[in-house]
């Protein structure tokens, strides 16, 4: 543990202010983890006076940092950038006279307590006030920052010329593109500081490059993947009081694909499980032995689980008999396109001739997620019927 | 050299104000918490409180909160204790007591005390 | 503020080992401090961090700290070694002195 602190494998706590730490704890190596520590507490420590950029970065676990009562002058830019955990840091009564956004805002912070500082009246902490106006009353701080004339003004009275919050604008917000297709984006940032600009594009599998200059920026994104459909592309703009955000859900629109069919399953019903992919929603159609199935209360296809464009389902049927054998075929389709599976089910053998289920399909249970049925398509017509299952099978089972 | 200075002994009389130093040397004065010990005689040490000379930050134990103020002089390195109306009860030996060092050295110095007398 | 609790005396016979012991809440928590202090003198730092020793403090003198005591040992105790014995920590605000012990090599 470090000398004048006391740890524990979780919590390293410096509050005995003789003689002090002079600079933030570090673990000496072959002792406690430090990815095992989610809590430091520092009081009292007069000559603490600078976080530098690598002194937490070890504590990667940490969710609480307290720095209380001592003399914190100095928090380097990059000082939190690998503790992500960080919920609460509360530097109470230090020497802060300045801090920026920038250490704080890759972080989900719910707490950050700034009290007794002697800040300095200038537009760096200008995004202070802004984080207080947009908090619930009961959190407020009671924060000041001394003017040129070293008077203490409050914080919630702060007014600085040039000095507020950015602007994002988004050419299209709305976004519909074929699979393959490529599109630009354009965006247009304003504000005084002048903001940056960058594109927060999430986990985008399709290329993308960016052209910005300081208020404009384009992006384009080429052969659209239709993995990327339903994806938020958000143009941020920001500066040292705060950012502005303007997005574009993109809606990728392709050709359906049978990406899954399986042979039939049992549980409480019968399953023949399926997953279809496709945007707009694909209509489905089932086909036994070459004709269209009609579906009926006895068998239907129902969609246990949606994940935007993909759909996962089965085709259901109570109590199949030997009348229900047979090749089952799968069409998906919409206006791009369409796809078909087949597969073959033998539910039961012919009485008298064989007795079982075909040993090439066992009762594997299927997940059924027990959601209410989710149609795609209407598949009714009634001619061509095949026969309705709602019988018991002859070896006295019902499925 | 760290060495801790006191002024000499004082008798006084009930409900007189009295104001005891303490000089520090051969540290950095600013930079480390200074405390005062009450020893009554016959008795055990009490912690009275601490500063921190360099931004004069105070912290009392409570059975001296409002009794007693401590200050200090950066200045001229001085530390403070002193009372605006002596009591009896406050007959006893102060010390001064800092920690200026790193760990392994002797990390705490004591003043030679000052003797209080209240008496009528 | 928390009371560190000592025992009022011990007695220890010269070359034996003594154990004066110091109790408070959840004291394994804070770093204890122990002092001797001799007729008409100031108080010397014997322990401090729990078990370290400053310089030309002799080794005969060790400490612990756990849980809600901190335990003070002098093995092979010495005529010298007689004296009041006094515990301390910080807490919350302040620093915290133990009620205090005399020690009596008999």
């Known amino acids: 543990c470090p000398t004048s602190c006391k740890c524990s494998a979780s919590r390293i706590w410096c509050s005995d202010p003789s003689p002090g730490i002079v600079a933030f704890p570090r673990l000496e190596p072959n002792s406690v983890d430090p990815e095992n520590i989610t809590e430091i507490f520092i009081a009292n420590q007069k000559r603490l006076e600078i976080i530098n950029e690598d002194d937490v970065e070890a504590y990667v676990g940490l969710r609480n940092l307290t720095i209380v009562d001592s003399g914190l002058k100095f928090v380097a830019h990059k000082a939190f950038l690998k503790n992500s955990n960080l919920q609460h840091i509360n530097f109470t009564r230090n020497k802060l006279t300045s801090l920026s956004r920038k250490h704080f805002r890759h972080l989900d912070l719910s707490e950050l307590i700034l009290v007794g500082n002697p800040f300095t009246c200038s537009c760096d902490i200008m995004w202070i006030k802004t984080l207080q106006e947009a908090k619930s009353s009961p959190d407020t701080q009671d924060l000041y920052c001394l003017n040129e004339s070293s008077k203490n003004i409050p914080l919630a009275n702060l007014q600085i010329p040039n000095c507020g919050l950015p602007s994002a604008n988004l050419a299209a917000p709305n976004l519909t593109v074929e699979e393959g297709k490529s599109i630009t984006l354009s965006c247009s940032v304003a504000g005084d500081p002048v903001p940056n600009m960058y594109w927060d594009v999430g986990n985008l599998v399709s290329k993308h490059m960016n052209e910005t200059s300081h208020t404009q920026g384009s992006l384009r994104i080429t052969n659209i993947s239709s993995d990327d459909s339903g994806k938020q592309i958000s143009c941020v703009a920001e500066n040292l009081v705060g950012e502005d955000q303007d997005s574009v859900n993109l809606t990728v629109h392709f050709a359906p694909t049978i990406t899954f069919l399986e042979s039939p399953t049992s549980d409480h019903h019968w399953c023949i499980p399926f997953t279809v992919k496709g945007n707009p929603k694909p209509a489905l159609q089932w086909f036994y032995n070459g004709a269209i199935l009609n579906e009926s209360k006895y068998i239907c296809t129902k969609i246990h689980v949606t994940n935007h464009t993909e759909y996962h389902g089965c085709l259901q049927l109570d109590n199949p008999t030997h009348m229900n054998n047979g090749d089952y075929t799968l069409i998906a389709k919409n206006e791009y396109g369409k796809d078909e599976k087949q597969i073959s089910a033998h539910f039961m053998g012919w009485p008298g001739i064989d007795d079982g289920a075909n040993p090439n399909y066992p009762d594997v249970i299927y997940e059924d997620y027990g959601t209410a049925a989710n149609d795609i398509g209407d598949t009714t017509n009634r001619s061509n019927e095949i026969p309705s299952t709602d019988v018991t099978d002859k070896t006295g089972r019902e499925h | 050299e760290v060495q801790l200075v006191q002024s000499g002994a004082e008798v006084k009389k009930p409900g007189e104000s009295l104001k005891i130093s303490c000089k520090g040397s051969?540290?950095?004065?600013?930079?480390?918490?200074i405390g005062w010990v009450r020893q009554m005689p016959g008795k055990g040490l009490e912690w009275m409180g601490i500063i921190y000379p360099g931004d004069s930050d105070t912290r009392y134990s409570p059975s001296f909160q409002g009794q007693v103020t401590i200050s200090a002089d950066k200045s001229i390195s001085t530390a403070y204790l002193q009372w605006s109306s002596l009591k009896a009860s406050d007959t006893a030996m102060y010390y001064c007591v800092v920690r200026p060092a790193a760990a392994g050295t002797r990390i705490d110095y004591w003043g030679q005390g000052t003797l209080v007398t209240v008496s009528s | 503020q928390s009371v560190l609790t000592q025992p009022p005396s011990v007695s220890v016979s010269p070359g034996q080992t003594a154990s004066i012991t110091c109790s408070g809440d959840k004291l394994g928590d804070k770093y204890a401090s122990w002092y001797q202090q001799k007729p008409g003198q100031s108080p010397v730092l014997i322990i401090y961090?729990?078990?370290k020793r400053p310089s030309g403090i002799p080794e005969r003198f060790s400490g612990s700290n756990s849980g809600n005591t901190a335990t003070l040992t002098i093995s092979g105790t010495q005529a010298m070694d007689e004296a009041d014995y006094y515990c301390q920590a910080w807490d919350s605000s302040t620093y915290v002195f133990g009620t205090g012990t005399k020690l009596t090599v008999l």
């Open positions: 961090q729990d078990n």
């Open positions: 051969g540290y950095s004065f600013t930079s480390y918490w």
